[in-house]
């Protein structure tokens, strides 16, 4: 059958003729009704590329380099398996590129320039592309030759399979730059092995490089790595301190028609007959062909790769940078150390044109991109398409676990002048229900909810972590008779009682009616039983001040909270009345941008913050008539976090805790992508 | 709420010009931002300029050098001079005074603009 025919792409004679027993031998293993393998063979890698874009083939297995390639614009394919190393307890699918130095010298990744580098192969990722893409904008002009430049900027270096004779700097600490084992600081150990000689100052290797060369942990802390932010680690804090993660060797398919789940289905059962240790006959990870073939021979098994994660997310944005800079060549005509506008994610129509109010009034200094949802955003701003956004915490969770930073807090309480450097402890998460009922926390089954949308703290992570723990599944949508959490499946009970309108109905920006603190509490007012907002929402939503006509006529007096032990309060009492204190709202930003949006951000917040009095006449940034748009309407001013510069410490060990623990519930596709 | 009506529209040939006038039916003196959006056939509706109560001015980076966005509060309008107009410029163009279009959508009619040979 053509349409579960998964046509392989070949690069070789040799290739073709193991996916030609690859076919075979699957075909013996499969029922009828399963996955079968085609076999198309082409001159190269880019050949293949262009083939499965074409529909002329569906899969090839690549190094980063070409994973690249594949997701330029036309080819436009996407990662949908990827293979691993090491164990399938602890598989690795990726290696990190690191810059390693030895503890005693004193100079950061901004200082290398005249330093003494050693490279483990000219081309090679780890060792050439990644740090000489990324320092390409330090680089000394003209930036071609490439290698010229290169020696112009560090004093001597180690690049094996350099030509010595044009770039006798490349050479200066390798004498003619052989490219074989031959030359003591060849590949990997050979580039270490020059740091730790003395010839070189720092070794672009990868992060696996120290623990092979250095078994002993006292030797190995006498090195440290270089960070991007200009800071230094200790070796084994690789994940947080790397020039790029790299992906070893994927499988790549169209992103429209891909066949993906084909090709996983197809993968997985040939890992399960044909892989590590399974089978004499056929090996897919080995071949008496050649090596490499087809698949890497070191590999273990394979990985679907998350359906979120596109070929940007996959890569990572250092990565990107690093091979984007060598290929295209083009450096910014403003020096790297000046801040460039910051642009802002706005959460669909509503937000952009706050945005681009902001935009006009801020001579610039703000640019806007869009995205129809919080996840979305997130991902923008982890590609570089976007630099920030104020994201509630439980999206400050998931934006944190995908290596973006919190860099200002929004406060709610602390009056200026003192606003600006004060931390403060956070909101209530408060459950409302409208006094005329008889309601406690303890009858909630078979009631109607009202969310501000999944993910989120006050509408989501705290009232169903709580309820988590009470119930022993994830199935709210059966504990609830029906509810409007917007983010949830479309046809879920808890998309039954949003409002809409039709095509936006239940997602999770402005466009639906009942999305956010507002919306939850109009869901409450309108249809539903209890909404789970901030303590705030009630007081800000009647006695007129909301003057929507579905708001203008309510009284708080006409609302309570629900207390934990079963009681009821007036929601004058939060303190004494909540599910949990929340962390305040937070922008974040990728690491490279934290500055300089912090800087922006503390400068437009003088000239737009709450100190403007008039918002009929003056742009504000804190104001949107109760719609929260880009930030909290009740923010005072940003905040610095002075140390709470994680997300970890930011939002708290306690509320950590709690979402990682509400995980296995978890319906974000951007976390599944981020932790893979 | 004062109401803002975009006139000025129509077919020019690719190079040519055409100034855009949005007149309010009130005060613009104490408004913040005044901006022209447009909007293409299937397309988002974007920015195309804007310009704040102290004269300030920004422009998209499709029509920077070419397009001038400026304030007449006595006369209260606002007016968008193009110059060298393309046929990727054909559009719907409308100007907001962003009070209301935060919150509901809430446009005007627009004014036509065709570049085409």
């Known amino acids: 059958v053509p349409e579960k025919s998964v046509r392989w792409c070949a690069v070789s004679e040799h290739e073709a003729t193991k996916c030609q027993s690859f076919r075979d031998h699957m075909k013996s293993v499969l029922p009828s009704n399963g996955p079968s393998v085609a076999c198309v063979k082409k001159a190269s890698h880019l050949d293949c590329i262009r083939a499965i874009a074409a529909n002329e083939a569906d899969a090839v297995t690549l190094d980063a380099g070409l994973v690249y390639d594949a997701y330029l614009a036309p080819n436009n394919l996407k990662p949908v398996v990827a293979e691993f190393y090491g164990s399938k307890e602890d598989p690795q699918t990726f290696y990190y590129a690191v810059a390693v130095v030895k503890k005693d010298s004193d100079f950061q990744m901004n200082q290398l320039r005249g330093r003494k580098s050693c490279h483990t192969g000219l081309g090679r990722s780890a060792g050439w592309n990644i740090p000489i893409g990324l320092l390409y904008c330090d680089l000394p002009e003209p930036r071609k030759p490439l290698e010229k430049a290169v020696a112009n900027f560090f004093s001597g270096s180690c690049v094996p399979c350099a030509d010595g004779t044009d770039f006798p700097q490349l050479c200066q600490l390798c004498p003619g730059c052989g490219c074989s084992t031959l030359n003591q600081y060849f590949s990997y150990s050979g580039a270490f092995k020059c740091l730790k000689d003395g010839a070189g100052d720092v070794a672009f290797v990868k992060h696996s490089t120290i623990f092979e060369n250095l078994a002993n942990k006292a030797d190995r802390d006498q090195y440290e790595l270089l960070c991007l932010d200009n800071t230094r680690k200790s070796v084994d804090e690789y994940k947080d301190c790397h020039l790029a993660r790299v992906p070893s060797h994927t499988v790549v398919a169209r992103s429209v028609g891909g066949k993906e789940d084909l090709i996983w289905e197809l993968l997985n059962q040939a890992q399960e007959h044909f892989g590590k240790d399974k089978s004499k006959e056929f090996q897919l990870f080995s071949s008496p062909h050649g090596k490499d073939l087809l698949f890497k021979d070191s590999a273990h098994g394979f990985l679907k790769v998350p359906p979120r994660m596109d070929a940007k997310m996959y890569l990572g944005y250092e990565y990107i940078t690093a091979i984007r800079n060598l290929r295209e060549g083009t450096c910014p005509e403003a020096p790297t150390d000046e801040c460039k506008p910051v642009k802002w994610c706005a959460l669909s129509h509503h937000e952009r044109l706050k945005c681009d109010e902001w935009s006009v009034n801020s001579a610039g200094k703000i640019e806007c991109e869009s995205a129809e949802t919080t996840e979305d955003c997130i991902a923008k701003i982890m590609n570089g398409e976007a630099d920030a956004m104020s994201l509630d915490g439980g999206f400050v969770y998931i934006a944190g676990m995908c290596g973006l930073v919190p860099v200002l807090a929004e406060n709610y309480n602390t009056p200026n002048p003192n606003c600006e450097n004060t931390a403060e402890e956070g909101y209530f998460a408060v459950a409302v229900v409208k006094s005329s009922s008889d309601l406690t926390w303890d009858n909630l089954k078979g009631k109607k909810s009202c969310h501000t949308a999944v993910g989120r703290t006050a509408g989501w992570n705290i009232p169903m972590g709580l309820l988590y723990s009470k119930i022993n599944h994830c199935r709210f949508d059966e504990f609830f008779s029906e509810g409007c959490a917007p983010g949830s499946e479309k046809n879920s009970s808890l998309c039954k009682l949003c409002m809409g309108p039709s095509p936006n109905l239940c997602e999770p920006n402005n466009k639906e009616g009942y999305y956010g603190y507002t919306g939850a509490f109009r869901c409450l007012v309108e249809k539903g039983d209890v909404a789970f907002v901030k303590h705030q929402t009630v007081p800000q939503n009647t006695g007129g001040k909301n003057p929507d006509a579905w708001a203008k006529n309510l009284k708080e007096e006409d609302y309570e909270l629900l207390c934990l032990d079963g009681s009821r309060k007036s929601v004058q009492e939060p303190a004494n009345c909540h599910l949990a204190r929340a962390p305040n709202h937070a922008v974040v930003a990728r690491k490279d941008k934290a500055d300089c949006v912090q800087t922006l951000l503390l400068d437009q917040q003088r000239m737009f913050g709450s100190s403007v009095t008039d918002c009929s006449s003056n742009f504000c940034l804190f104001e949107s008539k109760t719609k929260d748009l880009l930030f909290r309407d009740d923010t005072v001013c940003l905040a610095k976090l002075h140390d709470r510069n994680t997300y970890e410490k930011y939002l708290g060990e306690e509320y950590v805790k709690a979402v990682t623990n509400l995980r296995k519930c978890s319906t974000s596709p951007l976390l599944e992508a981020c932790t893979f | 709420q004062v109401k803002l009506e975009e006139s000025g529209g129509g077919l020019v040939q690719p190079g040519g010009s055409l100034r855009l006038s949005c007149a309010a039916s009130g005060s613009i003196v104490s408004i913040a931002t005044m901006a022209w959006y447009r909007q293409a056939p299937g397309k988002q509706r974007e920015l195309v300029a804007g310009i704040t109560r102290g004269g300030s001015t920004k422009y998209a980076d499709s029509v920077k050098g070419r397009f001038t966005i400026s304030r007449d509060n006595a006369k209260n309008t606002v007016y968008l001079q193009m110059h060298s107009l393309k046929p990727e410029d054909t559009a719907v163009y409308y100007c907001?005074?962003?009070?209301?279009?935060?919150?509901?959508?809430?446009w005007g009619q627009g004014t036509q603009v065709t570049v085409s040979s």
């Open positions: 907001t005074d962003y009070s209301r279009t935060y919150y509901e959508d809430h």
